[in-house]
Interface confidence: medium
């Protein structure tokens, strides 16, 4: 490049040359300083002067440069007689996250300047998402056909999935990167021989207040014709907050007859339009034999006959449970599948995904919605997440 100027070996740092003074000279010096939240570590004063050999020299430390170290604003603790100060730190997690460690989160500086925890050594803790603790839980006095608007964000685990043919279904966030849904939802508008790789790019997924998240892969349950379940892995972990939070997976089976669960959903309403607002309904777990008789005429295998009032037969087996309509004739409907049957454990003040809605065709016509028991699939879920 021809700039038309002589190029010298001195950088122009925009600093004007200081004026000369009689019987004096200009000595070049610099002062090192640190950015916000850092402080200078040096035995000198941070001022360096240019010597004859064009080296920057500090009076106290010579050419040894200072360092900037994090300033945690922590004053040095006072010394005590016959004692010493032991440096220790406690790791804590931000809101909506909790510490995962076998230790207590307290680390002490050893002689080799390593931070060590008594129980786990130098293995650091991790912050994992809190599950099942919505900031504004659903009001128990308060389709989904009918139901109540979730104005408060009481179901932060509820995701909305849209197929490439624009059909809305549900999915349930179970950790920062994984969601449960039904295999049928994943196969919507796909042929039976579609693979998980074919399906993933055709889905659009939203969490929280219509926050778009990208799907990395889907994994179908190995026995998905009988266990209507699939897992969705996101490309990135979601940030957990008031609007987005996973639901906990249960350590016990909450699907006891009469227990009330909450089902939220984006499914069809009384106009058979997909609802613009997340709705929820409270539904009781039903007697399984009554449910089987309702859909299949009998609990005796050889006497069974398809008799679904809505013309479509649900999958009913040892991996499923049924929930009845509410006393207000509220019910789940098309598009609510994949949503959780969420049970609030009052003692733990924690919400658990007891079931995943599989048969969402009841729409206040048939008496029961059908859910896959989460306890039946938990081992597979944990194994799949660990392997992926």
């Amino acid at each position: 490049v021809d700039s038309g100027n002589d190029v010298t070996d001195i950088a122009d740092d925009g600093c004007p040359k200081p004026p000369e003074i009689a019987h004096g000279y200009v000595e070049h010096s610099v002062r090192y300083q640190c950015k916000n939240y850092y402080k200078l570590r040096t035995e000198g004063d941070g001022v360096y002067t240019l010597n004859d050999k064009k080296q920057w020299i500090n009076k106290a430390v010579g050419d040894k440069l200072p360092e900037c170290e994090a300033d945690d604003g922590c004053p040095k603790p006072p010394e005590i007689a016959h004692g010493y100060v032991e440096h220790s730190v406690r790791y804590q997690c931000k809101n909506y996250y909790k510490l995962r460690t076998e230790g207590d989160g307290v680390y002490t500086l050893n002689n080799e300047k390593q931070w060590i925890n008594k129980a786990v050594g130098d293995k650091l803790p991790e912050c994992e998402a809190v599950c099942g603790k919505p900031k504004n839980p659903a009001n128990p006095v308060q389709r989904i056909l009918g139901g109540h608007l979730d104005a408060k964000g009481s179901f932060p685990w509820q995701a909305k999935m849209v197929s490439h043919h624009n059909l809305t279904t549900g999915a349930t966030l179970i950790n920062e990167q994984w969601l449960l849904t039904t295999a049928k939802n994943l196969f919507l508008n796909h042929s039976e021989n579609a693979t998980a790789k074919d399906i993933a790019p055709t889905l659009t997924l939203y969490v929280g207040k219509k926050q778009l998240v990208e799907i990395e892969k889907v994994v179908l349950h190995p026995n998905y014709s009988q266990v209507d379940i699939g897992l969705i892995k996101l490309k990135q972990k979601v940030s957990v907050n008031e609007r987005v939070m996973p639901i906990c997976l249960p350590s016990k089976d909450y699907a006891e007859v009469g227990r009330v669960g909450y089902v939220s959903g984006w499914g069809r309403n009384a106009n058979f339009k997909f609802t613009d607002h997340l709705k929820y309904v409270m539904l009781p777990v039903a007697d399984q034999d009554q449910c089987i008789r309702h859909y299949e005429g009998s609990t005796v295998p050889e006497k069974k006959t398809p008799k679904s009032p809505v013309g479509v037969q649900p999958i009913l087996n040892e991996h499923t449970f049924c929930a009845g309509m509410s006393k207000y004739q509220e019910d789940t409907c098309y598009g609510d599948a994949g949503s959780a049957f969420a049970v609030h454990d009052l003692e733990e003040d924690t919400w658990y995904a007891t079931g995943i809605l599989s048969f969402d065709k009841s729409c206040a016509v048939a008496e029961y919605g059908v859910y896959v028991k989460v306890t039946s699939i938990q081992d597979w879920v944990q194994k799949t997440i660990a392997e992926n």
């Epitope: 308060q142 389709r143 056909l145 009918g146 139901g147 109540h148 608007l149 309403n269 009384a270 106009n271 058979f272 607002h277 709705k279 809505v310 013309g311 479509v312 207000y328 004739q329 509220e330 065709k361 729409c363 206040a364 016509v365």
Partner: antibody, heavy 115, light 107 residues
Framework: EVQLLESGGGLVQPGGSLRLSCEAS????????MTWVRQSPGKGLEWVSS????????YYANSVKGRFTISRDNSKNMLYLQMNDLRAEDTARYYC????????WGQGTMLTVSS | DIQMTQSPSAMSASVGDRVTITCRAS??????LAWFQQKPGEVPKRLIY???SLQSGVPSRFSGSGSGTEFTLTVSNLQPEDLGTYYC?????????FGPGTKVDIK
Amino acid sequence: EVQLLESGGGLVQPGGSLRLSCEASGSSVSSHFMTWVRQSPGKGLEWVSSISPNPAYTYYANSVKGRFTISRDNSKNMLYLQMNDLRAEDTARYYCARRSDFDTWGQGTMLTVSS
Amino acid sequence: DIQMTQSPSAMSASVGDRVTITCRASRYIGKDLAWFQQKPGEVPKRLIYDASSLQSGVPSRFSGSGSGTEFTLTVSNLQPEDLGTYYCQHYYTFPLTFGPGTKVDIK
């Protein structure tokens, strides 16, 4: 714009049967909920029955459940209401309407149940 | 079932008046509410849907508000042609129900 036209009303004796029809023209109603609403002389409006588009799920008011049957023929753009075991209190003008929020109404057809 | 109540049941107002009709649902219905006008001897006509959306072709003097269980229909500048009976109706879940109606006549 869709127009709805009801027909089939008339005078029937108690215990009798009748079928009302509603023809939609100007636009297809196959993708919409369809509904029957009635109004007894000098009285207010009462929802009777609704049918979803596809699959055709049916919903009834308690007062007609077990006696009335709603159906539709999407290929003909028709809605029907089969009324059995008619009672004096079923006397009313019957309207067919589109959707569950009734954005479009027909002119209605009068049913009188009397001996 | 969700019960709908309306008040007043009847009213008399002058041309140019601002008229307000209230509708209450016995329990939560979100914004799934419509208002209808029925003139004597005529078919009901929808004025408002989704609690506050104006049906196309309906004069802007009609407006709706509310959500949850309390709803209002307002006619800001009553005209002679506005006489008739006004009904609210929820479409939140089945069974669908109407309010008993408010009869408006012109003084």
